[in-house]
């Protein structure tokens, strides 16, 4: 094949080599950029900056080598458009520093920075950590800071990410209240801070106030949907990023739903309960407290992380006609109580019997109607009624 006269020449099926002295001062308009997986650049002393726009359209890039060139600055977001990048070689350039943000979000198997006049500062604490943890092939490079000795020996006691403290209200929060959160940010070289509110959606009206070092957030007219939702304060400095998440507990009364019994490896009477704080539960069978046992018991499904509602089953492992009847679930918390009832028929009675005859079942009587109200516990009875905390 004839030698390639261009600044950049194809290399293999999806590679490009740019090695002609001084031919490039940026990476715009590289031929076949969208299909490139490998880009090798050498001897480009005019290529001094690498920025977001330079790598736009190089979405398939896996290996990037820029060596023996004039690179002085790599923007923190330079590799935003190259998420598949796994090998990055920037050796023998003029880099004094490289932000932690530059490599954030990439899964770099190899990062080569040897031969650069690195300046030891907290901004390179992340790189020092890579060296300590054996990441990206960094330890083998024995990186030096220009005139300061090995990177490994850089003092780092004062190199910390920001410290965050989020103040939330101590008092109970009710539906419709306004809630003020404050995020106190401490640390050196603070650059940016803010709130992440992606989970909130319609849970409250949001108003942000203040700036570093004290950020305010007002959640106005909160709803019960705010429960279990993360409100996150974040801050960044040259060392890295810190985040702290809090949740605001919005009190609301217990509610309960019952569904028709289903056969699911034996039987299940499905239920859903909600409330904040989490309600306690009691089951009644034909108006009497149902004592839970290993063959009739409450079992919860795994809770969703971002909601208060709990789903579960009253499990009946071997129900017969004796278990046919009216099941009531009572749920109560300090803000209210609720109940729901359902008739369940598991099996026809195989025996002839007079409906007036008593069926011997060990249940404790309870003074309540089955629509609402708190069961009254008789003091002289064995306290067998089960209370299950949901949460």
């Amino acid at each position: 094949a004839a030698p390639c006269p261009d600044a950049c020449c194809p290399h293999g099926s999806s590679g490009l080599r740019c090695t002609r002295d001084g031919a490039l001062d940026s990476l715009h308009h590289l031929p076949g950029a969208e299909n490139l997986t490998e880009l090798y650049i050498e001897n480009q002393q005019h290529l001094q900056h690498l920025e977001l726009r330079d790598l736009r359209g190089l979405g398939e890039l896996r290996n990037l080598t820029i060596v023996k060139s004039g690179l002085r600055f790599v923007a923190p977001d330079a590799f935003h458009f190259t998420p598949r990048l796994s090998r990055l070689n920037l050796s023998f350039n003029a880099l004094e520093s490289l932000s932690w943000k530059t490599v954030q979000g990439l899964s770099l198997q190899e990062l080569v920075l040897s031969g650069n006049p690195l300046h030891c500062s907290c901004a390179l604490r992340w790189l020092q950590r890579w060296e300590e943890e054996g990441l990206g092939g960094v330890p083998e490079q024995k990186l030096q800071c220009h005139g300061q000795g090995p990177l490994a020996h850089m003092p780092n006691a004062s190199c910390g990410v920001p410290t965050l403290k989020v103040q939330v209200p101590n008092a109970s929060v009710d539906v419709g209240d306004d809630v003020l959160l404050r995020c106190q940010v401490e640390g050196r070289g603070l650059e940016q801070a803010g709130w992440i509110l992606t989970e909130l959606e319609q849970s409250a009206t949001v108003m942000k106030s203040g700036g570093l070092p004290s950020l305010g957030l007002t959640l106005a007219n909160v709803t019960s949907d705010l429960n279990r939702k993360n409100v996150t304060c974040w801050a960044e400095n040259d060392v890295g990023r810190a985040e702290v998440s809090v949740q605001v507990n919005v009190s609301f009364p217990a509610s309960v739903q019952l569904h028709t019994a289903v056969e699911m490896h034996h039987w299940c009477i499905p239920f859903s309960v909600d409330g904040q704080p989490a309600p306690s539960l009691r089951w009644l069978f034909n108006g009497s407290v149902l004592n839970e046992t290993s063959f009739i018991f409450t079992e919860f499904l795994e809770p969703a992380a971002n909601e208060t509602v709990r789903h579960g089953c009253l499990r009946l492992n071997q129900p017969t006609h004796v278990n046919n009847g009216n099941y009531t679930l009572l749920a109560a918390n300090p803000f209210g109580q609720a109940s729901a009832s359902i008739m369940a028929a598991f099996m026809d009675n195989p025996f002839e019997f007079n409906p007036e005859d008593p069926i011997p079942v060990s249940f404790s009587p309870v003074d309540t109607n089955s629509t609402s109200g708190d069961p009254v516990e008789k003091k002289d009875e064995t306290p067998f009624g089960v209370s299950v905390a949901v949460g």
Partner: antibody, heavy 117, light 106 residues
Framework: QVQLVQSGAEVKKPGASVKVSCKSS????????MHWVRQAPGQGLEWIGE????????NYNEKFKNRATLTVDISISTAYMELSRLRSDDTAVYYC??????????WGQGTTVTVSS | DVQLTQSPSSLSASVGDRVTITCSAS?????MHWYQQKPGKAPKRWIY???KLASGVPSRFSGSGSGTDYTLTISSLQPEDFATYFC?????????FGQGTRLEIK
Amino acid sequence: QVQLVQSGAEVKKPGASVKVSCKSSGYTFTNYWMHWVRQAPGQGLEWIGEIYPNNGRVNYNEKFKNRATLTVDISISTAYMELSRLRSDDTAVYYCARSRYDPMEDWGQGTTVTVSS
Amino acid sequence: DVQLTQSPSSLSASVGDRVTITCSASSSVGYMHWYQQKPGKAPKRWIYDTSKLASGVPSRFSGSGSGTDYTLTISSLQPEDFATYFCQQWSSIPLTFGQGTRLEIK
């Protein structure tokens, strides 16, 4: 695989107490009831009680209600059975066994408790 | 309490025999469960929900019954079947076991 490993043999004097442990592994401890059953030498099986680690619910055989205490430590997936005011007729092998939707699916290897003056 | 009475209490039989053990409950139970125990060992769940064989139990074993009367049957006795068998109810507290049926080689 599921394992229920019980503590070692005990020799106790009448009037003393004994606490037998049952360490679970290979399954989600809180999802299963734990039963305690004993067997006197040459005799049948006698159910002492059951506990649900998920909420601490306990049911006892009336015969043992005032002397047996069932507890769990969820952090180490271990169930305990303590029997107080021991008598010579409490000499037996004590077993733990787990159940969820079917009865006593798996059993511990047993702990021999000897009550002798 | 629901009393369970097994019969016979002990039984001598030969390899190849068909063997039936019965369990009678003092009041109706929905299902019966059976355990096998060998000397010095913990019981093993053998038949549950009246007729379901536990994992690893040979098909020569079967269970049947309803209400108050239940049976465990071995169609053709094998040497490894010689053991003690207990019935158990799981329908009311306290859970109770039969007194056991010891199956011995004749």
